[in-house]
């Protein structure tokens, strides 16, 4: 690679989180090169005996790939030439969490950057009126969370109110024995008010809102990953 040993190039990564059982992206960009054949991308994971992924001379080179990543990794080959070294990780596992290194060699030089990858489960909550209850009750459900989150209710009218005494939250283990279904019930609900069910763990924060009036019910959900500078 000619002068690659003498210069360093800028490599940039973004901390991110993966939702177990789904596909994830480990983001990495670098100063692009004009020749694809001069670019080497290596993804490494701290404390792992083999490589996570290697891309060189325009194709994957997986002879030294670690068993735990076999068949689960891919780079965006058509975007490497423009400086995208991001890694697609299929079927994210809890054990994929850790520190990763994106290591790049081009004809301009070499560089690397680390990223923290968290893994867990997170999902949008849905808030509904529970018509089966004896009093006006709201039910907040989210199908997949891990680690176990906290659930907090809030209301637009009673801002700052503590609803812990009039709510009940349960966590039900899902069939794969890792993630859990979150169900939280809020009692003594008044109409013409907007209630929020906030679910949070160290990976993500999700909010389900419901506005209950005499004539209609409006719902809105929002999910935000924590500690990822996206």
């Amino acid at each position: 690679f000619g002068i690659s040993g003498r210069h360093s190039i800028t490599v940039t990564t973004v901390a991110s989180a993966g939702n177990i059982g789904e596909d994830g992206i480990l983001s990495c960009t670098f100063e692009p090169d004009i020749k694809l054949s001069d670019i080497v991308i290596q993804w490494l994971k701290e404390g792992v005996l083999g490589l996570v992924h290697e891309f060189k001379e325009g194709k994957d080179e997986l002879s030294e790939q670690d068993e735990m990543f076999r068949g689960r990794t891919a780079v965006f080959a058509d975007q490497v030439i423009v400086g995208n070294a991001s890694l697609r990780l299929k079927n994210v596992q809890l054990t994929d969490a850790g520190t990763y290194k994106c290591y790049i060699i081009t004809s301009k030089g070499k560089g690397n950057a680390n990223l923290e990858y968290k893994t867990g489960a997170f999902s949008m909550p849905e808030v509904n009126v529970d018509y089966n209850a004896s009093s006006e009750t709201l039910r907040c459900e989210a199908p997949r969370w891990f680690p176990q989150p906290t659930v907090v209710w809030a209301s637009q009218v009673d801002q700052g109110a503590n609803f812990s005494e009039v709510s009940n939250t349960s966590f039900e283990l899902n069939s794969e024995n890792v993630t859990m279904k979150v169900v939280s019930v809020l009692y003594n609900v008044t109409i013409n008010n907007t209630y929020s069910c906030m679910i949070e763990n160290d990976i993500a924060k999700a909010t389900g809102d419901i506005k209950v009036t005499e004539s209609e019910i409006k719902r809105r959900s929002h999910l935000q990953l924590l500690n990822s500078k996206a």
């Epitope: 490494l44 404390g47 490589l51 002879s63 969490a97 520190t99």
Partner: antibody, heavy 122, light 107 residues
């Protein structure tokens, strides 16, 4: 100062089981893969098993596959080797050793414990 | 599995001698080779990693070379404390294998 301290060795009958432990200190335990290496009396070194830093990957020599299980508890900075269906040829001093931090760019087996003797005999 | 063959299995030498030990892998291991020194009743000590990188604190009389399948450990001027058994070890990806050892004895 990096220290590795093995324990759990002893005399066991063929077909029996034993669990070895290796207590680590002086470094960020979860950042490193760890290995077990054994040495039969008067013989050479034989790599037995390794485990990744997070515990998600385990690796075994063919001679112990299906009988030995490596594990770790990063909250206790401890490495384990569960040995089942022990045979006379498993008699050896068992060492734990610090393995790599990063593939291809760091040292490995740079720190070793003092070893613990496992004797399989009737 | 990758096999490692060391030669000779033992050698006799004198203080000040230049000693060379060779190690051959059954398939290419690039530069993923380490050398260890072991004295009786002691744990092994890392000397060389990545075929030619000297571990911190190891005297410069020890050197390693080679890549692919053929590797060499050289002690440029043997010292009294160097009489020991030396092992090569491959660490290609997720397997590790040791050579059978070379015992360096006093002539």
């Amino acid at each position: 100062e990096v220290q590795l301290l093995e324990s759990g060795g002893g005399l066991v009958q063929p077909g029996g089981s034993l669990r070895l432990s290796c207590a680590a200190s002086g470094f960020t335990f979860s950042s490193y893969a760890m290995s077990w290496v054994r040495q039969a009396p008067g013989k050479g070194l034989e790599w037995v098993s390794a485990i990744s830093g997070g515990g998600g990957s385990t690796y075994y020599a063919d001679s112990v596959k299906g009988r030995f299980t490596i594990s770790r508890d990063n909250s206790k900075n401890t490495l384990y080797l569960q040995m089942n269906s022990l045979r006379a040829e498993d008699t050896a001093v068992y060492y734990c050793a610090r393995d790599i931090q990063w593939f291809g760019e760091s040292t490995l087996f740079d720190y070793w414990g003092q070893g613990t003797l496992v004797t399989v005999s009737s | 599995d990758i096999q490692m063959t060391q030669s000779p299995s033992s050698l006799s030498a004198s203080v000040g001698d230049r000693v060379t030990i060779t190690c051959r892998a059954s398939q290419s291991i690039r530069s993923w080779l380490a050398w260890y020194q072991q004295k009786p009743g002691k744990a092994p000590k890392l000397l060389i990693y990545k075929a030619s990188s000297l571990e911190g604190g190891v005297p410069s009389r020890f050197s390693g070379s080679g890549s692919g399948t053929d590797f060499t450990l050289t002690i440029s001027s043997l010292q009294p404390e160097d009489f020991a058994t030396y092992y090569c070890q491959q660490y290609n990806s997720y397997s590790r294998t040791f050579g059978q050892g070379t015992k360096v004895e006093i002539k």
